[in-house]
């Protein structure tokens, strides 16, 4: 359904955030994040900026990652004379009102934005190779960028369910985007999975009094172990068990415990 | 100038498709959203979905997913929507409709295609 | 979806009379993105009133819009012939795109 989503991250807090390689004008990519149930993407300071950043450097996007690219975000210089020495932003400021972190905290410009004090101005997010971000940007709200960024606001997620034996897992989150993983996913997101015999298996993320759960789910394994231990939330053997200084690094699969010997699994 | 021309009005029988066309003009039909609205004779308006023809991306009103169905001819600058199983409640007139000097009000609509079941 | 209530559903007023109606979101909506639509039988849509207070090209200055939040209105400082209509409001500040049910406004 919308073959431009690309990748997406969520964090703890609640925010989602998603990239689209598509050559667009500002505002087509602005309501591009609308009809996803979200906005343009803020890239204030701290936590935003690292889920931003970590997204772009998740891969390259059409090219390969040969040619610089461009990515709208929530950025603008309103009509009027901003005052182009007021840093970090120089007069540029963030469509959205809600508080971030300090704006001394955000990217560079690429390139010092011109003055302009007739026509409102947007600015771009600049990324060397499509992966690495090298700053701001301005560029004409009118032309077209390779790219947007989308941010999207819960009041809770739920964390990634483990696979134990599950395999070809794909979620779908709500903001219309396939993804093969995602640490915090929002209410609405459905995770399908293969379990042992190519059984298919389906859990929606739910949110209720309590918070967000995965619906369907019996504990936080998406498909049972057939043995006694779990690894990074995957099924293990207990020989895979063992961490490189000799420590227990496994967990035990529903059902059954720690033993005495704090390094093997016993029926609970 | 721009235009939206809508193909003619439809009388069609319960359980079967429609489609209807939005013949864009006067812009660049790439690169601007374009969205469909129902509305039922003597009723308000619904908003069913919206194609950007520049990558085919679209997006639905959850209540017309798998009634609706949204592509675009960009050589012809031309919309079209599908409507599936027909019943009486899709008797309407259906209005394709862009936002394009104003930010997201849908500022140039077409005259509209009247669909009776 | 955000749900967009507006009132009075049917109105009559007189010639030269001010009439207001109003529109009440179900949760709060950014100005920027609440628009007012005119409709006259038999015709298409037309933008009205884009965020909030814009008139869109051709719209008599006798019109104006105001609003924020979960509450907006439109405005006819003296009503005239042409402006009877149904006026509706419409909402882009979330998807899916949602209208109000109309303000038909007849002369008394």
């Known amino acids: 359904e919308h073959p431009t989503a690309d990748r997406a991250g969520c964090s703890a807090s609640g925010a989602c955030y998603s990239l689209h390689h598509a050559t667009m004008k500002r505002q087509a990519a602005e309501e591009a994040c609308i009809l996803r149930g979200g906005a343009l993407s803020t890239v204030r300071a701290g936590a935003e900026l690292r889920a931003v950043l970590a997204l772009l450097r998740a891969g390259p996007g059409p090219g390969g990652g040969s040619k610089d690219l461009l990515f709208w975000v929530a950025l603008q210089l309103p009509p009027g004379c901003g005052d182009p020495k007021r840093l970090p932003l120089r007069g540029f400021s963030w469509l959205s009102s809600d508080p971030g972190g300090l704006e001394s905290d955000t990217l560079q410009w690429v390139e010092e934005p011109q003055r302009s004090c007739t026509a409102r101005r947007c600015a771009v997010l600049q990324a060397t190779g499509g992966v690495e971000p090298a700053g701001w940007k301005e560029m004409r709200c009118h032309l077209r960028a390779n790219g947007y960024l989308c941010k999207y606001q819960f009041e809770v997620l739920c964390p990634a369910p483990r696979p134990g034996a599950a395999s070809n897992l794909s979620y779908r989150a709500p903001f219309q985007l396939h993804s093969a993983a995602l640490d915090f996913s929002p209410p609405g997101t459905e995770v399908s999975a293969l379990c042992r015999g190519q059984l298919p298996i389906s859990v929606t993320c739910i949110a209720d009094e309590i918070g967000a759960r995965w619906d369907k789910l019996s504990g936080d394994v998406l498909c049972p172990c057939p043995g006694r231990y779990l690894r990074a939330g995957k099924c293990a053997e207990l020989p895979n068990c063992l961490d490189d200084l000799g420590g227990f690094a496994c967990e035990c699969a529903t059902g059954f415990e720690l033993g005495k010997d704090g390094r093997s699994c016993v029926t609970s | 100038e721009v235009q939206l021309q809508q193909s003619g009005t439809v009388l069609a029988r319960p359980g079967a498709s429609v489609k209807m066309s939005c013949k864009a003009s006067g812009y660049t039909f790439t690169s601007y959203w374009m969205h469909w609205v129902k509305q039922r004779p003597g009723q308000g308006l619904e908003w069913i979905g919206a194609?950007?023809?520049?990558?085919?991306?679209?997006s639905y009103n959850q209540k017309f997913k798998g009634k609706a169905k949204l592509t675009a001819v960009t050589s012809t600058s031309t919309a079209y929507m599908e409507l599936s199983s027909l019943t009486n409640e899709d008797s309407a007139v259906f209005y394709c409709t862009h936002y394009y000097g104003s930010d997201y009000a849908m500022d140039y609509w077409g005259q509209g295609t009247s669909v009776t079941v | 979806q955000i749900v967009l209530t507006q009132s009075p559903a049917i109105m009559s007023a007189s010639l030269g009379e001010r009439v207001t109606m109003t529109c009440t979101a179900s949760s709060s909506v950014s100005s920027s993105y609440l628009h007012w639509y005119q409709q006259k039988p038999g015709s298409s849509p037309k933008l009205w009133i884009y965020?909030?207070?814009n008139l869109a090209s051709g719209v008599p200055a006798r019109f104006s819009g105001s609003g924020s939040g979960t509450s907006y209105s439109l405005t006819i400082s003296s009503m005239e012939a042409e402006d009877a209509a149904t006026y509706y409001c419409h909402q882009y500040h979330r998807s899916p795109r949602t209208f109000g049910g109309g303000t038909k406004l007849e002369i008394k």
């Open positions: 965020s909030t207070s």
């Open positions: 194609i950007y023809p520049g990558n085919s991306d679209t």
